[in-house]
């Protein structure tokens, strides 16, 4: 049977979304214990049926990986949880509509910073998502989004950073004093999602000048 | 059986506010977004907006953003429509109606009618 | 906001006859993800709440008598009723779920000659 309020048994059922990875999770009301079942169905936008996640029914734990099932971009997705507890009661709640393009969060990019004498080097990594084009092929972040930048900084001293960005996916910052650290920090920015990942830290050292020696 | 049974006719004075409720049975209220739509002989059928009672988000017609607001009791599994500041023009039949795209099932209607 | 055009605003037909009545939008009703239109048609008789018939242009609802068949793509559409019953007389109305806000038609009002 149904219990008082839905929330006693089931709260917070959401879809955590990062780089395309799409993980649905939820949390136990005040009313669930540790033996509370957990059955979870997705369905498209319009459509009436929804369908169970295998591997996903009568289960004990709290997520569910929904990335394979939500992986068309253009299409929007419910979810829901229904919760069982051991008495036998039962709650149903459901996302909001949920749009991969929309919502996912972006981590930070994958970078190699190499250190010069003079310079700092930075080479940027593509970005693989779980979304797969027609042939079969994983897609990167840069395929998925057109107007994909990045934004780098390299803090010099306390008052002073040198920026760079572009599509491109090598940098230089040059003109740095030899054997010196140097902060940089790389972001991934899509304008048009209004989306910028968390940034990717590396702290460099500059070479030392061994001309002089 | 899915049944919404809304809350009766409403006489009201202009500049008061009115919530009306419907009332889920049949099927869990947290496990399909409610809609509201307003019929007036003026207007045809307007969607006011709709609500996932689940986590309570709403989105509204823009039309209807100052006048309306959309609540669900999870425990009662009851939705309702609240409207304020009333006049002539909020004079109509709202429905209540289930689903996230079209509507499959409606609530009976309840008359709200402004009048001093 | 999309706008929904319907005609005629009401015709009158005898028992049997086939009907046909249109609902224009002012822009594509296309969904790209699955490739079905945005548009459902409901049918509302007098004193009663609206019915659904139709949802996707053409999927017609479970227990909906087969004389009602939708039809069109894009920005054109169509509800017909192969024969009329006395039965069918109610006003019918198209809905587009493609973009917020969802609109609906002014309505096509069926009487029975």
């Known amino acids: 049977h149904a219990p008082e309020d839905p929330s006693d048994l089931l709260q917070h059922v959401k879809f955590q979304s990062s780089n395309f990875e799409n993980i649905l999770t939820w949390d136990s009301g005040p009313e669930g214990t540790p033996d509370t079942v957990y059955s979870i169905e997705y369905k498209t936008y319009g459509e009436r049926d929804w369908v169970a996640k295998k591997g996903c029914q009568r289960i004990t734990r709290k997520s569910c990986n929904l990335t394979v099932e939500t992986g068309n971009l253009t299409e929007l997705y419910y979810a829901r949880v229904t919760a069982v507890s051991a008495g036998g009661r039962s709650a149903t709640k459901m996302t909001d509509r949920f749009s991969s393009l929309q919502h996912t969060t972006l981590k930070p990019p994958d970078v190699t910073c190499i250190s010069k004498v003079r310079s700092i080097q930075m080479i940027v990594h593509p970005t693989p998502t779980p979304i797969r084009a027609g042939d079969g092929h994983r897609l990167t972040l840069e395929d998925i989004f057109h107007d994909l930048f990045y934004h780098l900084e390299l803090q010099v001293n306390r008052t002073y950073q040198m920026h760079l960005g572009g599509k491109q996916r090598e940098y230089e910052f040059f003109g740095l004093t030899p054997d010196t650290e140097f902060l940089g920090t790389i972001m991934i920015c899509v304008p048009t999602w209004a989306k910028e990942s968390a940034p990717y830290m590396c702290r460099v050292k500059t070479l030392p000048d061994r001309t002089w020696t | 059986e899915v049944q919404l049974q809304q809350s009766g006719p409403e006489l009201v004075r202009p500049g008061t506010s009115v919530k009306i409720s419907c009332k889920a049975s049949g099927y869990s209220l947290t496990a399909d977004y409610m809609n509201w739509v307003k019929q007036s002989p003026e207007e045809s059928l307007e969607w006011i907006g709709e609500?996932?009672?689940?986590?309570?988000?709403?989105t509204y017609n823009q039309k209807f953003e100052a006048k309306a607001t959309l609540t669900v009791d999870q425990s009662s599994n009851t939705a309702y429509l609240q409207l304020t500041s009333l006049t002539s023009e909020d004079s109509a039949v709202y429905y209540c109606?289930?689903?996230?795209?079209?509507?499959?099932?409606w609530g009976q209607g309840t008359t709200v009618t402004v009048s001093s | 906001d999309i706008v929904m055009t319907q005609s005629p605003s009401s015709l009158a037909v005898s028992v049997g006859e086939k009907v046909t009545m249109s609902c224009k939008s002012s822009?594509?009703?296309?969904?790209?993800?699955?490739?079905?239109?945005?548009l459902a048609w409901y049918q509302q008789k007098p004193g009663q709440s609206p019915k659904l018939l139709i949802y996707?242009?053409?999927s017609r609802e479970s227990g909906v008598p087969d004389r009602f068949t939708g039809s069109g793509s894009g920005t054109d559409f169509t509800l017909t009723i192969s024969s009329v019953k006395t039965e069918d007389l109610a006003v019918y109305y198209c809905q587009q779920y493609f973009s917020y806000p969802f609109t609906f038609g002014s309505g096509t009002k069926l009487e029975i000659k």
């Open positions: 609500i996932n009672p689940s986590t309570g988000t709403t």
């Open positions: 996707w242009a053409s």
């Open positions: 109606a289930r689903f996230d795209a079209y509507f499959d099932y």
């Open positions: 822009q594509s009703l296309l969904y790209s993800s699955n490739q079905k239109n945005c």
